[in-house]
């Protein structure tokens, strides 16, 4: 059966800056097409279970699935199919109009850096504990990957890190992301956004934990020196970050211009799309070069601020230099000033 | 193990239609993913992708010849039939009959070939 | 149509010999590339696909690589039997071969 199960069976995404996340294409026949979400007797809108693409994000070498679903904005290329059947079946597809396609997006997680682990091992004259000391990231239940309240265990004890606002602890955040293989430290969250709070019927592993640590020395190397075990508090902050590896990123589209390569920005945030708003910290072409790649068009031609004489246009405003860094949004409810910009076009 | 052959005319009049027939087992052509064409070699040169038939009746012409070729299956036979009308002394080749699978795994297997001349 | 340009038209080395064999293309073709060898009066057979992929029974000396316009078919060590024509192929937009490559033995 002609499956994404075929060992020999080849797809890639696209439309994003990374090779993990994207538009599915599958090369079928005579090239590649564009799935359209409405295979298999989906509907546009549904969203699936996605593990069961997980052959198709290793095929990638990436990791594990984290959504399959609409990818909500549709680049026709020159072909488009609709397939049948069996979920992730290629054996009965048509060509799609373009226009009745809504593309399909996966969206896996980044591949694990082949780097070593930081951490260095114990000295040979102490015994080996029964766990090496390892953190973990855990996010809202379809929240972000490399994003979370941070837990550290250490054989059989394991918690949540105390953390203070005053605490300088900027090598040691970078360190910890790092150590997980998220890249390096982008910001506190607050513990809202990380997840702190649990759903009473949640499983076993993410109730609370019995022990807590507090930071020990920010400056470590080895995680078996960061951190010092405390009596749990009731109430204070614990330890949440975002990591520059977070996933999945901000998704961007150029519209109402002659060609994908040209535009007005829009971002998406959840399952809507909106104009970005011009931002001073952005004043640069790094931003709009980041679109640009993304849209897999060349380098950037112009970009130019359209006027917001209208207080009621609305949109999403990113407060740092480049989108990749966005862990969120935040809706601007007037004088949104949009940014239309022009890429060079790779196919003029 | 898989094996193709053709057959067909040795020598085919200008203007005439040239028909061809690949026979081909250890594989059969209702299996999805299943593609049988041809690609041809004039003589002393290089190869020329022809057309291909898949397992669901979708065909692939070569643009600059397909205006002259038709493709057709008999997934039942075992076979794979070409026509390619109004030929000319350019369609002199050796003719070869090629498997090639969905997955984009190359032409894997090839007949003999069967060289065909086009002269009066 | 994808123009695959393939060099050296031919080439002559001695058994043992590192052999490398280039394929452009005139746009980007991905990975979409196989490589074929045709032995005289034979038909070609199927070396690599996919670039770098070895079909079955294929020697581990032939190796491929590239990506996007440029691409490589190499014989880390030249065998005699290794004598005959080698294609290139792409496949990501309809089907366009090089124009071949003979390899003699010294």
């Known amino acids: 059966r002609l499956s994404w199960y075929d060992p020999d069976f080849q797809a890639r995404l696209t439309r994003s800056n990374s090779k993990c996340q994207g538009q599915l294409e599958v090369y079928l026949k005579d090239g590649w097409h564009m799935v359209c979400s409405q295979s298999w007797g989906r509907s546009s809108k549904q969203w699936e279970d996605p593990s069961q693409a997980s052959k198709v994000c290793q095929r990638l070498n990436c990791g594990v699935p984290l959504s399959l679903g609409p990818f909500l904005v549709t680049y026709t290329p020159q072909s488009s199919i609709i397939c049948y059947g069996q979920l992730g079946s290629f054996s009965n597809c048509s060509h799609s109009r373009n226009d009745m396609c809504h593309s399909l997006g996966l969206t896996c997680l980044e591949p694990q850096k082949t780097t070593p682990p930081t951490t260095r091992p114990p000295p040979t004259t102490t015994p080996e504990p029964t766990a090496p000391p390892r953190l973990q990231l855990v996010a809202q239940s379809g929240g972000q990957h490399c994003a979370g309240v941070v837990e550290f265990y250490s054989g059989s004890l394991g918690g949540t890190i105390s953390y203070e606002a005053q605490d300088k602890t900027q090598d040691l955040e970078n360190f910890l992301c790092n150590n997980l293989q998220c890249g390096s430290f982008l910001k506190h969250l607050p513990e809202t956004e990380a997840g702190r709070a649990q759903d009473p019927g949640e499983p076993r592993e993410h109730q609370p934990l019995p022990i807590q640590w507090k930071i020990q020395n920010s400056s470590c190397t080895s995680l078996e020196h960061c951190f010092r075990k405390i009596k749990p508090q009731k109430s204070g902050r614990v330890l949440a970050l975002l990591c520059s590896g977070f996933q999945p990123k901000v998704q961007s589209r150029l519209v109402g211009g002659s060609s994908i390569c040209e535009g007005t920005v829009e971002v998406r945030q959840g399952a809507q799309w909106a104009a970005l708003c011009d931002s001073s910290s952005a004043r640069s072409s790094l931003r709009w070069e980041e679109v640009c790649r993304e849209q897999q068009c060349g380098s950037v031609n112009s970009y130019r601020v359209l006027d917001a004489g209208d207080p009621t246009s609305r949109g999403l405003f990113c407060p740092h230099q480049k989108l990749s860094q966005c862990h969120e949004l935040w809706e601007r409810n007037s004088y949104c000033k949009k940014v239309f910009v022009t890429c060079q076009d790779p196919n003029p | 193990q898989v094996t193709l052959k053709e057959s067909g005319p040795v020598l085919v009049k200008p203007t005439e239609t040239l028909t061809l027939t690949c026979t081909f087992s250890g594989f059969s052509l209702s299996t999805s993913g299943m593609g049988v064409g041809w690609i041809r070699q004039a003589p002393g040169k290089g190869l020329e992708w022809v057309a291909h038939i898949w397992w669901d009746d979708d065909v692939y012409y070569n643009p600059s010849l397909k205006s002259r070729l038709t493709i057709t299956k008999d997934a039942s036979k075992d076979q794979v039939s070409l026509k390619l009308s109004s030929v000319t002394a350019a369609d002199t080749a050796v003719y070869y009959c090629v498997r090639r699978r969905a997955t984009g795994t190359g032409f894997d297997y090839w007949g003999q070939g069967t060289l065909v001349t086009v002269s009066s | 149509n994808i123009v695959m340009t393939q060099s050296p038209s031919s080439l002559s080395a001695s058994v043992g010999d590192r052999v490398t064999i280039t394929c452009q293309a005139s746009?980007?073709?991905?990975?979409?590339v196989a490589w074929y060898q045709q032995k005289p009066d034979q038909s070609p057979k199927l070396l690599i696909y996919w670039t770098s992929t070895r079909h079955t029974g294929v020697p581990d000396r032939f190796t491929g690589s590239g990506s996007g316009t440029d691409f490589t078919l190499t014989i880390s060590s030249l065998q005699p039997e290794d004598i005959a024509t080698y294609f290139c192929h792409q496949y990501n937009s309809y089907n366009t071969f090089g124009s071949g490559t003979k390899l003699e033995i010294k």
């Open positions: 746009q980007d073709v991905g990975t979409a």
